[in-house]
C-alpha cells in the first residue's frame, strides 16, 4: 500500500481541507521536473525561473548566463537551441501547434560572439522544423515541405528537395499517420554523428484518402480541414529514405537508401533511423502486416557515393504470437565497435529483455532475464549499460534504473535507484550527459516528484535539481486520498489495479465506484506515480472510490498478457474491467448500485463497450472522444493489432467490435458521449456514428460536443469538460451539489 504524502496527526485534521475541482482546473498542485539540456560531459543548459539561459559546469561548480531574458523577450522567444560550436543560438517564437508533436515557428539566429542577431539570409517563416548539426553550426530546416541546408547561419540556403507539396509530399517531416503512429516526432531527418551526412524521409501521400472536417472559427463560412489520413485497410503513404553529403550537397545530391528485398515485396513502413558512425547507418523497416521487422545496417560506399545495405547486415525480428515489438519496435543501441548492438525484444519465455546482437539475431546473447521486462536502454558506454525495468519487488508499475557492467565478465548488475528514496520514489527516468559522465534522475512518484544530479561513475548524488518544496508545503493542509496498488489473480491472469480511496476511508462503509479505463494495447495505467488530478478530487471531496485496472493487452507483464488481444480488440480489455469490478464488489465497501466507468480515446471505446456489455454492473458512464469502429481509425495503429478489414483477413471482428453494434444495450445505462468536432486523431465521425445508432435504436443518452477542439480538449474546454462530467457523475451517484 502506498500512502502519500505522509499523513499528519488527527488533531490537525480539522485544519485540513479536501481538494476542490477549482484546484484541479487551476493546476494548483502541479509539479515540476528538471531535465538538464546537456551540452557536454559535464555541462548543461537550463532556463531559469526569470527566463535567462544559464550554462552550468558541474565540475567547476560555476554557472553563467549565455543568453539574457532581455534577448529572449526581444523576439518573444519561447524556446532556444545552442549550436554545438557554441557560437550561435536559435530562438523560437510564434509557436503554432499542428498535430500531437508538430508545430511551426519563427526562428531567429543570435550570434553569441558579437551579441547580435544574424542579419542577411534570414530564415523564412513559418518553419516546420529546424535543427543544428551535431558538430559546428550547420543548419537544416524544413520550409513548405522542403529541406534546406545552411553551412553557416548567415549563408544563403542550399535547397535539398524540390518536390514538397502541402498534403502531398512531405520531406524531412512526417505526414499525419507517421507522426502519430510510427515516429512519434515532429521531424523525419537525422544528422550523422559528426554532421557529414543528413538523412531524411520523404512521404508521398498523393494516393491517401483525405479526412475532411469543418473548422467553424468565427468567419461567415466554416473552413474545411483536409488531412491525408489512411484508415484501416486504406492506401498508405509511400516512404523513401535519402541521405545527402552536407559537405558537397550538389555533387551527387540525395542518395536513396535501398529497402530490404523481403520488405519491399509488399506494403511496408519505415520505422526508425539510427546513425552508428558518419559512414554507417541503421534503418528499421516493418511489413504492413506488422509482425515482421527488418533492421538493416548500411555503409557509405565512397566509390558509389551511395549506401550499401548488404543482406548479411539485415536482422529480422518476427513475432509468431502477436505484432513485432511493444507499442513500437524497439530501436538498437550500438556498442563501440559500431556493428554490434543492444536491443529489447521478447525472449523465449515471452518477456521483453535486452539482447546483445553481434552477428545474427539467432545468436543473440540475452543480457537480462526474468518474469519482468526491460523497458528502455538509456545509454551504453565502454563499460556500462544503463536501462530501466520493472523488476524490483515484482511491481510492474514501477520503473527503476539499473547499471550492467559490460566491461567485466561476468557482467554485474546494480540497481541505481531502488533504495535511494524508497517510499517516495519508485518510478524513475534518467537523462545522461556525454559518455554518461553525469546523469539526472527524475522521480515521478509515488511521492512528490524530485529531480537529482548524479556522478556517472560512482552513482553518488551530487545535488537536488528540483524537489517541489512549494508543492509539498501547499499540500500540507490538503486531505489527499489514499492510494493502493495491488493485484487480483483471476483464471491464471494477474490484474494489477490502483485504488484511490477517500481520505477517511472506512472499509465498513459503502462507496460509489468509478472505474477509469484506458486499456489500449501496450498501455499501462497502474503506475507508481504522483498525481493530483480530477480523480484525486473525486475521492478527496466527493467520497468516491476510483479504480484503474490493467487487464489483458496492457504492457510490461509479458507477451501472454500483451498479445492476448491480438486480432480481437474490444473483447478481453472489457471482460477484465468487468471481472475487476466484480472482485471489488466482493471486497465489501462498494455500493453496487453506484458504479460508473469513464475513459478517453481508447478508454472511451472500452468504457462504451463495458456499459453496453449487458452485465447490469454499471449505472452510468462517460466516453470522451471514443473510437467506435476500428474501420474509422488509423491504419498503422489499427492494423498492428487487428490485421486488415478484408474478408480473407479480419473483417468479421472489425464489424463485431463496434460500439454501434451494441446500441440496444445502452438502454439501461446513463451514457454521456463527448467529442471535439476538430479531432484530427479520433475523428468526430466516431461519436457521430454512435449517436446515430443510439437514435436509430431510440435509446436516450446525453452528449456534449466541443466546437473546434481536437483530441486533447484543451484550454477552456478542459474546465467545461471536467465540470460537466463532475455534474453527470454526482447526479448518477445521487451526490448533492
Amino acid at each position: 500500500i502506498v500512502l502519500r504524502p505522509s499523513r499528519v496527526h488527527n488533531s490537525e485534521e480539522n485544519t485540513m481541507r479536501a481538494l476542490t475541482l477549482k484546484d484541479i482546473l487551476n493546476g494548483t498542485f502541479s509539479y515540476k521536473t528538471f531535465f538538464p539540456n546537456w551540452i557536454s560531459g559535464q555541462e548543461y543548459l537550463h532556463q531559469s525561473a526569470d527566463n535567462n539561459i544559464v550554462l552550468y559546469n558541474i565540475e567547476t561548480g560555476q554557472s553563467y548566463t549565455i543568453l539574457s531574458n532581455r534577448t529572449m523577450k526581444s523576439v518573444n522567444a519561447s524556446n532556444y537551441g545552442l549550436s554545438p560550436d557554441r557560437q550561435f543560438v536559435y530562438l523560437e517564437s510564434d509557436y503554432s501547434k499542428l498535430w500531437r508533436y508538430s508545430y511551426t515557428a519563427t526562428y531567429y539566429i543570435y550570434d553569441l560572439s558579437n551579441g547580435e542577431f544574424v542579419r542577411g539570409n534570414e530564415l523564412p517563416r513559418p518553419i516546420q522544423y529546424l535543427c543544428w548539426s551535431p558538430v559546428g553550426s550547420k543548419l537544416a530546416y524544413v520550409y513548405q515541405n522542403n529541406i534546406y541546408l545552411k553551412q553557416r547561419p548567415g549563408d544563403p540556403p542550399f535547397q535539398i528537395t524540390f518536390n514538397g507539396r502541402e498534403n502531398k509530399i512531405f520531406n524531412g517531416i512526417p505526414d499525419w499517420v507517421y507522426e502519430e503512429e510510427m515516429l512519434a516526432t515532429k521531424y523525419a531527418l537525422w544528422w550523422s554523428p559528426n554532421g557529414k551526412f543528413l538523412a531524411y524521409a520523404e512521404f508521398n501521400d498523393t494516393d491517401i484518402p483525405v479526412i475532411a472536417y469543418s473548422y467553424y472559427g468565427d468567419e461567415q463560412y466554416p473552413r474545411t480541414i483536409n488531412i491525408p489520413y489512411p484508415k484501416a485497410g486504406a492506401k498508405n503513404p509511400v516512404v523513401r529514405i535519402f541521405i545527402i553529403d552536407t559537405t558537397y550537397p550538389a555533387y551527387v545530391g540525395p542518395q536513396e537508401v535501398p529497402v530490404p528485398a523481403m520488405i519491399a515485396s509488399s506494403d511496408y513502413y519505415f520505422s526508425w533511423l539510427t546513425w552508428v558512425t558518419d559512414e554507417r547507418v541503421c534503418l528499421q523497416w516493418l511489413k504492413r502486416v506488422q509482425n515482421v521487422s527488418v533492421l538493416s545496417i548500411c555503409d557509405f560506399r565512397e566509390d558509389w557515393q551511395t549506401w550499401d545495405c548488404p543482406k548479411t547486415q539485415e536482422h529480422i525480428e518476427e513475432s509468431r504470437t502477436g505484432w513485432a515489438g511493444g507499442f513500437f519496435v524497439s530501436t538498437p543501441v550500438f556498442s563501440y565497435d559500431a556493428i554490434s548492438y543492444y536491443k529489447i525484444f521478447s525472449d523465449k519465455d515471452g518477456y521483453k529483455h535486452i539482447h546483445y546482437i553481434k552477428d545474427t539475431v539467432e545468436n543473440a546473447i540475452q543480457i537480462t532475464s526474468g518474469k519482468w521486462e526491460a523497458i528502455n536502454i538509456f545509454r551504453v558506454t565502454q563499460d556500462s549499460l544503463f536501462y530501466s525495468s520493472n523488476e524490483f519487488e515484482e511491481y510492474p508499475g514501477r520503473r527503476n534504473i539499473y547499471r550492467i557492467s559490460i566491461g567485466s565478465y561476468p557482467p554485474s548488475k546494480k540497481c541505481v535507484t531502488c533504495h535511494l528514496r524508497k517510499e517516495r520514489c519508485q518510478y524513475y527516468t534518467a537523462s545522461f550527459s556525454d559518455y554518461a559522465k553525469y546523469y539526472a534522475l527524475v522521480c515521478y512518484g509515488p511521492g512528490i516528484p524530485i529531480s537529482t544530479l548524479h556522478d556517472g561513475r560512482t552513482d553518488q548524488e551530487i545535488k537536488i535539481l528540483e524537489e517541489n518544496k512549494e508543492l509539498e508545503n501547499a499540500l500540507k493542509n490538503i486531505q489527499l486520498p489514499k492510494e493502493e496498488i495491488k493485484k487480483l489473480e483471476v483464471d491464471e491472469i494477474t490484474l494489477w489495479y490502483k485504488m484511490i480511496l477517500p481520505p477517511q476511508f472506512d472499509r465498513s462503509k459503502k462507496y460509489p465506484l468509478l472505474i477509469q479505463v484506458y486499456g489500449g494495447p501496450c498501455s499501462q495505467s497502474v503506475r507508481s506515480v504522483f498525481a493530483v488530478n480530477w480523480i484525486s478530487y473525486l475521492a478527496s471531496k466527493e467520497g468516491m472510490v476510483i479504480a484503474l485496472v490493467d487487464g489483458r493487452g496492457t504492457a510490461f507483464q509479458g507477451d501472454k498478457l500483451l498479445y492476448a488481444v491480438y486480432r480481437k480488440l474490444g473483447v478481453y480489455e472489457v471482460e477484465d474491467q468487468i471481472t475487476a469490478v466484480r472482485k471489488f464488489i466482493e471486497m465489501g465497501f462498494i455500493d453496487e448500485k453506484r458504479i460508473a466507468i469513464w475513459g478517453w480515446s481508447y478508454g472511451g471505446y472500452v468504457s462504451s463497450l463495458a456499459l453496453a456489455s449487458g452485465t447490469g454492473l454499471f449505472k452510468c458512464g462517460i466516453a470522451v472522444a471514443p473510437v467506435s469502429s476500428w474501420e474509422y481509425y488509423a491504419s498503422v495503429y489499427t492494423e498492428r493489432f487487428m490485421g486488415l478489414p478484408t474478408k480473407d483477413d479480419n473483417l468479421e471482428h472489425y464489424k463485431n467490435s463496434t460500439v454501434m453494434a451494441r446500441a440496444e444495450y445502452f438502454r439501461n445505462v446513463d451514457y454521456l458521449l463527448i467529442h471535439g468536432t476538430a479531432d484530427d486523431n479520433v475523428h468526430f465521425q466516431n461519436s457521430a456514428q454512435i449517436a446515430k445508432a443510439l437514435v436509430n435504436a431510440q435509446v436516450d443518452f446525453q452528449a456534449m460536443w466541443y466546437s473546434d477542439q481536437n483530441h486533447g480538449l484543451s484550454g477552456l474546454s478542459t474546465n467545461h469538460l471536467y465540470t460537466h462530467m463532475t455534474h453527470f457523475l454526482k447526479q448518477c451517484f445521487s451526490l448533492s451539489d
Epitope: T247, Y248, P258, R301, E302, D303, W304
Partner: antibody, heavy 120, light 111 residues
Framework: QVQLVQSGAEVKKPGASVKVSCKAS????????IHWVRQAPGQGLEWMGW????????KYAQKLQGRVTMTTDTSTSTAYMELRSLRSDDTAVYYC?????????????WGQGTLVTVSS | EIVLTQSPGTLSLSPGERATLSCRAS??????????MHWYQQKPGQAPRLLIY???NLESGIPDRFSGSGSGTDFTLTISRLEPEDFAVYYC?????????FGQGTKLEIK
C-alpha cells in the same frame, strides 16, 4: 575536356620503390575518386585501389596493403601512387583512372599509362 | 573476392555481324537498385575505354550499337553491327565488393 596525364616510363631494381604521378585537368579534381589499375604484359587488368582527393578517403586492394601508398596534391590537381619493395611481377603498365560521376565504380577517363619495369 | 569469368575467350566475327559477349560473376553484383557491372574496350597500346556502366547504361560518346544487359550474376555486352574499329579486347568489371575485379577479357577478332 577531362584529361589525365601520367608521368613517364620507369625502370627499377627489385626492392626499390616507384612513384607514378597523374595530373588531372578539365574537371573539379576534389570531386572524383582516382583509381589506380595495372596491367602486366599480355595480361588482364588488376585494380590496386582508390583515393578521394576531396575527403582524403583511401581504399587499397588487400593484396597490396602495406606496399602501396596513394596521395594527392589538390593545389596541383595531381594524384600519386607509390609502390615499394618492387618485385619482378610488379612489371606492368600502371593506369590512373577517374571514377565516373554516375558509374558507382565505373572508370570513365583513363590516363595514357606508365610502364614500370622491374629488372635486376 | 568476386571472380568474373568471360566467355568466349576469343570471338571471331566479320564486320556487320552481331557480337554477344558474356560475363558471369561468382556471386551477385546487383542490389535492388543497381547492378555494379561495367564494360570496357581496350585496343593494343591504349588505355581501356568505358562503354557501359551499371550493366546497361551507355557512356556518353559511345555509339548506340553497343548495349548491355543482365543482373545478378549473368551479364551480356552486345554489339549489334560490328564496325572495323570494334575489334579489340573487352573487359567486364564489378564494383559491388572490394577488391574491384575484372574479367580475363574476351578478344574480338576479325574472322
Amino acid at each position: 575536356q577531362v584529361q589525365l596525364v601520367q608521368s613517364g616510363a620507369e625502370v627499377k631494381k627489385p626492392g626499390a620503390s616507384v612513384k607514378v604521378s597523374c595530373k588531372a585537368s578539365g574537371y573539379t579534381f576534389t570531386e572524383n575518386i582516382i583509381h589506380w589499375v595495372r596491367q602486366a604484359p599480355g595480361q588482364g587488368l588488376e585494380w590496386m585501389g582508390w583515393i578521394h582527393p576531396g575527403s582524403g578517403a583511401i581504399k587499397y586492394a588487400q593484396k597490396l596493403q602495406g606496399r602501396v601508398t596513394m596521395t594527392t596534391d589538390t593545389s596541383t590537381s595531381t594524384a600519386y601512387m607509390e609502390l615499394r619493395s618492387l618485385r619482378s611481377d610488379d612489371t606492368a603498365v600502371y593506369y590512373c583512372a577517374r571514377h565516373g560521376g554516375t558509374g558507382r565504380g565505373a572508370m570513365d577517363y583513363w590516363g595514357q599509362g606508365t610502364l614500370v619495369t622491374v629488372s635486376s | 573476392e568476386i571472380v568474373l569469368t568471360q566467355s568466349p575467350g576469343t570471338l571471331s566475327l566479320s564486320p556487320g555481324e552481331r557480337a554477344t559477349l558474356s560475363c558471369r560473376a561468382s556471386q551477385s553484383v546487383s542490389t535492388s537498385a543497381y547492378s555494379y557491372m561495367h564494360w570496357y574496350q581496350q585496343k593494343p597500346g591504349q588505355a581501356p575505354r568505358l562503354l557501359i556502366y551499371g550493366a546497361s547504361n551507355l557512356e556518353s560518346g559511345i555509339p548506340d550499337r553497343f548495349s548491355g544487359s543482365g543482373s545478378g550474376t549473368d551479364f551480356t555486352l552486345t554489339i549489334s553491327r560490328l564496325e572495323p574499329e570494334d575489334f579489340a579486347v573487352y573487359y567486364c568489371q564489378q564494383s559491388r565488393e572490394y577488391p574491384y575485379t575484372f574479367g580475363q577479357g574476351t578478344k574480338l577478332e576479325i574472322k
